[in-house]
């Protein structure tokens, strides 16, 4: 399990994984856009076994999953998506 925490640069991900996680095992996804002291986009995944992982935003599977979730956004999302709030 990769550690996720706030750094002095306000980036939260120390390492990123590109390993596929099936949607059924994902509790929620947090998307943190570039900015607010962090120079890169970050995606944090909370899994159903209570572990947390940072996912490489360039990983094909997470891009596909986010696209599916965006298409479903008109109805209730099975996986809540949260975005970074920029003050």
């Amino acid at each position: 399990v990769l550690e996720v925490y706030y750094t002095s640069l306000r980036c939260r991900c120390v390492q990123e994984s590109s390993v596929f996680i099936p949607r059924r095992f994902i509790d929620r996804i947090q998307i943190l856009p570039r900015g607010n002291g962090c120079p890169r986009k970050e995606i944090i995944v909370w899994k159903k076994n209570k572990s947390i992982v940072c996912v490489d935003p360039q990983a094909e599977w997470i891009q596909r999953m986010m696209e599916v979730l965006r298409k479903r956004s008109s109805s209730t999302l099975p996986v809540p998506v949260f975005k970074r709030k920029i003050p």
Partner: antibody, heavy 121, light 106 residues
């Protein structure tokens, strides 16, 4: 041809332990999530546990958390289920199943023939 | 946790009949549903996945449909080998099977 062969079932007393094995062949084992599913005599199917490609991520149904441990050995193409503190309600045929490849089209596709676990005094 | 309610629990029908089995989910499962056939003493056999995709080698008399929380398996013209127990499986959030439908000869 995909083949899954379970072993290790048997009669065990309540509170006892058992380790189930599943030998896989005919596919690239390390490319798949794997799962254990059980079926009590004359009853329905019940998902027990799942494991990711390298064994680093595991998931369990609430009733077995802390008692059962799913693991795998990709070098041996084998899946395992260590069952501790067994209860009468764990009595079932236990199946291993391929669970997930990248696009999700192989969810619970191939199953073994099952191995019977009986928990009784 | 998502609950799956399958109905009917048992069904008597004759060869040639059209049969429909239903599964209702306690919440939207986004078509992430699989149907299985099981015969006594055998492992389940996958018939349909992702609601309506027929497994390779499964006869076209089997079909699936549905969306949101309601899903159906239809056998258009029952054959003798179709008498078995059928289960649905949701794979949207972990896994939950339906209780099963035993299809018997009338």
């Amino acid at each position: 041809e995909v083949q899954l062969v379970e072993s290790g079932g048997g009669l065990v007393q309540p509170g006892g332990s058992l380790r189930l094995s599943c030998a896989a062949s005919g596919f690239t084992f390390s490319d798949y999530y794997m799962a254990w599913v059980r079926q009590a005599p004359g009853k329905g199917l019940e998902w027990v546990a799942s494991i990711n490609y390298d064994g680093g991520d595991t998931y369990y149904r609430d009733s077995v958390k802390g008692r059962f441990t799913i693991s795998r050995d990709n070098a041996k193409n084998s899946l395992y289920l260590q069952m501790n503190s067994l209860r009468a309600e764990d009595t079932a045929v236990y199946y291993c199943a391929t669970e997930e490849d990248y696009d999700g089209s192989y969810v619970m596709d191939a199953w073994g023939q099952g191995t019977l676990v009986t928990v009784s005094s | 946790d998502i609950q799956m309610t399958q109905s009917p629990s048992s069904l008597s029908a004759s060869v040639g009949d059209r049969v429909t089995i239903t599964c209702k989910a306690s919440q939207n499962i986004n078509k992430e549903l699989t149907w299985y056939q099981q015969k006594p003493g055998k492992a389940p056999k996958r018939l349909i996945y992702n609601t309506n995709i027929l497994q390779t080698g499964i006869p076209s008399r089997f079909s699936g449909s549905g969306s949101g929380t309601e899903y159906t398996l239809t056998i258009s013209s029952l054959q003798p080998e179709d008498f078995a127990t059928y289960f649905c499986l949701q794979q949207s959030s972990l896994y939950t099977f339906g209780q099963g439908t035993k299809l018997e000869i009338k």
